[in-house]
């Protein structure tokens, strides 16, 4: 994926077995053919937390080799460590798989900082806490990398869930989810519930923690409250959407809405922060600073570098504003808004002060590649990637962190005119030069 500070996200998680929750009581009215309302076997199949990424257990090859794989809606390659590396506890051993097929083709993926490269092949892949299917999928076997795998993390690969257009080396390499849908009866849809902890977890707590759910092929009604609101996928490459208005504590930023989507706006589970274009970031921070002016914080905090600590349990959530993003709706001239709390955009950080303190980093940052709705946004919501109907749904997550005074929200409809004008059209010549 193209963002310099984006991937990989530190996982730092141990390998305790995934625990399935007891089945929930749900209203199981089907939304569409093949979409039941409860997917008990997939609930809680993710581990991780904001700032460290979320991973799912997958198996590759015959006999199956189990690996933890980072779930990334901001890229489109299924790539796994396939050679010894000091930071990997395990890796994909192609020579031990009777079903591995070499594609005799290499792949090289540079990032602004770091890179990975490897060899393309196919093999049988399944998701133990997913649909009961096995698919033959393209796999990039990572043989060399720099600043990709991270010491102390517990994942060995990445599952790019976006579209073929941004796959490497080119769009002819079918992404995993496309292969899954083609080869099985799994509906062309998945949904993510990422559950931020809201407080720093030490290693032993993380081992016992639950990160969230990736529901493959459907929607689980127990994972959200209220209604799902859908925004069109503008173009099938990244999961690109259009933001039409931004408010801080109900105050409109009053910018030309094109600025919000310059040069695009995407939903990306592989990014920690809410990343905003430079002008938008500056306006948003100015507004957040003004709203929280009873306390002052150093510039390094607003840059996402310094941590601010409060006595445990005394974080002044009330002085920080809510942030609302208005998204283009499915109906002409109609939008809806998603609202996040400081509990989402102040990211808890562990091991820096004493146990008597709660410390946080500001998790909104500047971007030169458009708006990125990363984990900071996604942890407030249950997000439905409805590829079949080219739309993304948002509902308030049943696991989002809030307080007794405020909660994340998804609300609508609102009348918004000329929303199509909010989209930025990337010049064709620029697209191929984007630094990955």
């Amino acid at each position: 994926t193209q963002h310099g500070i984006r991937l990989p996200l530190r996982s730092g998680l141990g390998g305790a077995p995934l625990g399935l929750r007891l089945p929930r009581e749900t209203d199981e009215e089907p939304e569409e053919p093949g979409r039941r309302g409860s997917f008990v076997e997939m609930v809680d199949n993710l581990r991780g937390k904001s700032g460290q990424g979320y991973y799912v257990e997958m198996t590759v090859g015959s006999p199956p080799q189990t690996l933890n794989i980072l779930v990334d809606t901001g890229s489109s390659n299924f790539a796994v460590g396939a050679a010894p590396h000091p930071f990997l506890h395990r890796y994909y051993q192609r020579q031990l798989s009777s079903t591995y097929r070499d594609l005799r083709k290499g792949v090289y993926v540079p990032y602004t900082q770091g890179k990975w490269e490897g060899e393309l092949g196919t093999d049988l892949v399944s998701i133990p806490h997913g649909p009961n299917v096995t698919v033959r999928a393209n796999i990039a076997a990572i043989t060399e990398s720099d600043k990709f795998f991270i010491n102390g993390s517990n994942w060995e690969g990445i599952l790019g869930l976006a579209y073929a257009e941004i796959a490497r080396p080119d769009d002819s390499l079918e992404p995993f989810f496309d292969s899954l849908v083609k080869q099985t009866h799994v509906p062309n849809l998945f949904s993510l519930q990422l559950c931020g902890a809201g407080f720093p977890l030490n290693q032993s707590e993380v081992l016992a923690s639950v990160g969230g759910s990736m529901i493959i092929g459907g929607i689980d009604h127990s994972l959200y409250t209220g209604s799902l609101w859908y925004t069109p996928i503008r173009r099938e490459w990244y999961y690109e959407v259009i933001i039409v208005r931004v408010e801080i504590n109900g105050q409109d930023l009053k910018m030309d809405c094109k600025e919000y989507n310059y040069d695009k706006s995407i939903v990306d589970s592989g990014t920690t922060n809410l990343r905003l274009p430079k002008k938008v970031f500056e306006a948003a921070v100015k507004s957040i600073k003004a709203a929280s002016s009873t306390e002052k914080f150093p510039d390094g905090f607003w840059l996402g570098e310094q941590l601010v600590c409060w006595q445990a349990g005394t974080t002044p959530w009330n002085i920080f504003p809510v942030i609302s993003l208005y998204l283009m709706g499915e109906v002409t001239n109609q939008s809806f808004r998603i609202t996040i709390l400081p509990q989402q955009y102040l990211r808890p950080v562990e091991d820096v002060a004493t146990s008597q303190d709660d410390c946080y980093k500001f998790a909104i940052s500047q971007s030169s590649t458009g708006t990125v709705m990363g984990a900071v946004i996604m942890e407030g919501f249950y997000v439905v990637f409805d590829r079949a109907r080219k739309r993304i749904g948002f509902a308030v997550s049943a696991c989002h962190v809030h307080d007794e005074f405020r909660t994340a929200a998804v609300e609508g409809p609102f009348v918004t005119l000329d929303m199509e004008d909010c989209g930025y059209n990337i010049p064709q010549t620029d697209e191929s030069t984007l630094m990955t």
Partner: antibody, heavy 120, light 108 residues
Framework: QLQLQESGPGLVKPSETLSLTCTVS??????????WGWIRQPPGKGLEWIGN???????YYNPSLRGRVTISVDTSKNQFSLKLSSVTAADTAVYYC????????????WGRGTLVTVSS | EIVLTQSPATLSLSPGERATLSCRAS??????LAWFQQKPGQAPRLLIY???NRATGIPARFSGSGSGTDFTLTISSLEPEDFAVYYC??????????FGGGTKVEIK
């Protein structure tokens, strides 16, 4: 130019409350550019941060002293104060007041310090 | 908790010599580190902030370097008034709370 001056009793009995005041002269304590803080230094030892205050009254304290320490501000008198309760001999130190500048990050201006001895 | 370890505890040098003081953080503090000078009976004085920026009025013979966990204060040529105790302080975790134990620069 801006100056800071600590004042208060030099001797406090064990179990009593230590009270010090820092008077800011040459500029307003209500400047939005600064926090104000207290640091102490036991004889022959290193520096220990006690806490900070913003003119609005927002405070931050050293976890090791929480429950005993209170810092307050009086903008009308251009002063901020330190109270440390239930003192023991271990609280004997030179107490400094200081300005937290450079974007609220660094103690860039200090008072001369005042020695407080805890003894009966 | 981030711990700052200064070394050496004492540095014995002659005027005109170069002094190199070290401050090591138990985990990365980026460039959010300051150096202070304290002479006997006086309050500390800010020398360096953000690891390498000289505070107002500080002579050019004082310089700071480093980032992450390892930092250095260098006095290129010691003047008689430079013999003092030097402290580092991290402000990566805010509010600034952690000082190093100090390095005493004494006349040889």
């Amino acid at each position: 130019q801006l100056q800071l001056q600590e004042s208060g009793p030099g001797l406090v009995k064990p179990s009593e409350t230590l009270s010090l005041t820092c008077t800011v002269s040459g500029g307003p304590i209500s400047s939005s550019s600064y926090y104000w803080g207290w640091i102490r230094q036991p004889p022959g030892k290193g520096l220990e941060w006690i806490g900070n205050i913003y003119y609005s009254g927002s405070t931050y304290y050293n976890p090791s002293l929480r429950g005993r320490v209170t810092i307050s501000v009086d903008t009308s008198k251009n002063q901020f104060s330190l109270k440390l309760s239930s003192v023991t001999a271990a609280d004997t130190a030179v107490y400094y007041c200081a300005r937290l500048g450079h974007g609220y990050n660094y103690f860039d201006l200090w008072g001369r310090g005042t020695l407080v001895t805890v003894s009966s | 908790e981030i711990v700052l370890t200064q070394s050496p505890a004492t540095l014995s040098l002659s005027p005109g010599e170069r002094a190199t003081l070290s401050c090591r953080a138990s985990q990365s503090v980026s460039s959010y580190l300051a150096w202070f000078q304290q002479k006997p009976g006086q309050a500390p004085r800010l020398l360096i902030y953000d690891a390498s920026n000289r505070a107002t009025g500080i002579p050019a013979r004082f310089s700071g370097s480093g980032s992450g966990t390892d930092f250095t204060l260098t006095i290129s040529s010691l003047e008689p008034e430079d013999f003092a105790v030097y402290y580092c302080q991290q402000v990566y975790v805010w509010p600034p709370r952690t000082f190093g134990g100090g390095t005493k620069v004494e006349i040889k």
